[in-house]
């Protein structure tokens, strides 16, 4: 990797060991001032294969709300409207980092965590498993 | 929200202040155990929307590596396999929280930020805009 | 560098066949598309196929009943085959490069002239 | 198809004056990825075209900043801020939203 030299003026650390423990400042930097949002807010309706988002709540987690996708049918909307089972609709899932607080209920002290989540669906061409 | 009560073995938090500083722990807990990574693996090369993986490489960043999809084409492909812009391929994009070093070069001092990165694409119907 | 060179014949006859080859250097056509476009002589520019990096293909639909296009990525050429060619298909015809992800053709042939001519 | 309404046919300039282009589309470029997918090229004569602008706004390697390209709804300018000799040649604005890919009819830049 790239070895970066340490700047003077960070702060100490005094737990040396692993599992490491850093400090986070929470007042989060969006560096999303140039896109817009409401761009990709219906592809989940206009998509052929589209799909409904779920809110999963966790207040252990922050962010304490996630919207998960669930495609809504196993095969894709076909060009006369209808779902055509020749293409499956599956779900893209992307591993994401999230904090958990740790000790349960803690204000200030967390524990990075990865979890899965389904952002959207796209239509694939089916694997045919041949029987021998 | 939910009010929950604190638990009194929470670390001490000296900064009362916002923006809000806290304590995470970096060993990282992996919540995917029960999914199969490879499944969603070879989507981005069956789906009728299918994109390319570029590596996003930040050491100022964690994760420091972010895989950034980009659609191929800008139509679907048809049952013929040919491109077909009556249809339109559309990157579905995610708001996702990474730890961002500040001060820069700081191996344990960060501050959250939310970016938005692409992490597949799917195909919709495209928009028909009338000129008056 | 890149480069793209048009290679065919000067002179059709009416109802006969076209092939014409863009042979390219400076990048691989594993990671670019490639378009065909023709200009017929004193007027403007119009597209006839491209075929994407995947080996992919998108027409003009009003001469796709008579265009192929084909490539061999390991010899860096690109095919342009047109049948049943008319008067007015003569024309300057050039390959282009496809401008990956932004959809431009950002480099072009010299061109190849052909005359549909008895 | 989409078709290309460029204007003025023919554009007589001198050395050193700014110089304005127009392409009118008949349809509404904006993809549904949220790009607008309007380019310009210039051909010189008894030379292939060259890309200058690609969506919209953006200048091609190599190009020089006097060029700008710019829109408002379907209707899209060239601009060339001082005019230089090597820039005499026909301008094509071109549309890779929609299939089939279209040109506009080309404008001729030339000295007074």
């Known amino acids: 990797g790239i070895t970066i030299p340490r700047n003077p003026g960070c702060p100490n650390s005094e737990d040396k060991n692993f599992p490491r423990t850093v400090m986070v400042n929470l007042n989060i930097h969006n560096r999303n001032t140039n896109t817009n949002p409401k761009r990709s807010s219906d592809y989940y309706n206009r998509s052929t294969s589209p799909w409904n988002l779920h809110r999963n709540e966790d207040p252990e987690r922050y962010p304490s709300v996630i919207w998960e996708a669930k495609c809504r049918h196993l095969g894709c909307i076909n060009a006369d409207g209808n779902v055509d089972y020749h293409m499956n609709s599956v779900p893209i899932q992307q591993e994401i980092l999230v904090l958990r607080r740790e000790p349960p209920h803690c204000p200030n002290s967390f524990r990075l965590e990865k979890i899965l989540v389904s952002v959207g669906c796209t239509c694939v061409t089916p694997i045919v498993h041949h029987v021998a | 929200g939910i009010t929950i009560p604190r638990n009194p073995g929470c670390p001490n938090s000296e900064d009362k202040n916002f923006p809000r500083t806290v304590m995470v722990n970096l060993n990282i807990h992996n919540r995917n155990t029960n999914t199969n990574p490879k499944r969603s693996s070879d989507y981005y090369n069956r789906s009728t929307s299918p994109w390319n993986l570029h590596r996003n490489e930040d050491p100022e960043r964690y994760p420091s590596v972010i895989w950034e999809a980009k659609c191929r084409h800008l139509g679907c492909i048809n049952a013929d396999g040919n491109v077909d812009y009556h249809m339109n391929s559309v990157p579905i994009q995610q708001e996702i929280l990474v730890l961002r070093r500040e001060p820069p070069h700081c191996p344990n001092s960060f501050r959250l930020e939310k970016i938005l990165v692409s992490v597949g694409c799917t195909c919709v119907t495209p928009i028909v805009h009338h000129v008056a | 560098e890149v480069h793209l060179k048009e290679s065919g014949p000067d002179l059709v006859a009416p109802s006969q066949s076209l092939s014409i080859t863009c042979t390219v250097s400076g990048f691989s056509l594993t990671t670019y598309g490639v378009h065909w476009v023709r200009q017929p002589p004193g007027k403007g520019l119009e597209w006839l196929v491209v075929?994407?990096?995947?080996?992919?293909?998108t027409y003009n639909s009003a001469l796709k009943s008579r265009l192929s296009i084909s490539k061999d990525n390991s010899k860096s050429q690109v095919f342009l085959k047109m049948n049943s060619l008319r008067t007015d298909d003569t024309a300057m015809y050039y390959c282009?490069?496809?401008?990956?992800?932004?959809?431009?053709?950002?480099?072009w042939g010299q061109g190849t002239t052909v005359t549909v001519s008895s | 198809d989409i078709l290309l309404t460029q204007s003025p046919l023919s554009l007589p300039v001198s050395l050193g004056d700014q110089a304005s282009i127009s392409c009118r589309s008949s349809q509404s470029l904006v993809h549904s990825n949220g790009n607008t997918y309007l380019h310009w090229y210039l051909q010189k004569p008894g030379q292939s075209p060259k890309l200058l602008i690609y969506k919209v706004s953006n200048r091609f390697s190599g190009v020089p900043d006097r060029f700008s390209g710019s829109e408002s709804g379907t209707d899209f300018t060239l601009k060339i801020s001082r005019v230089e000799a090597e820039d005499l040649g026909v301008y094509f604005c071109?549309?890779?939203?929609?299939?089939?890919?279209?040109f506009g009819s080309g404008t001729k830049l030339e000295i007074k």
């Open positions: 075929i994407w990096s995947d080996g992919l293909t």
């Open positions: 071109s549309q890779s939203t929609h299939v089939p890919f279209t």
């Open positions: 282009a490069r496809d401008y990956t992800y932004e959809y431009a053709m950002d480099y």
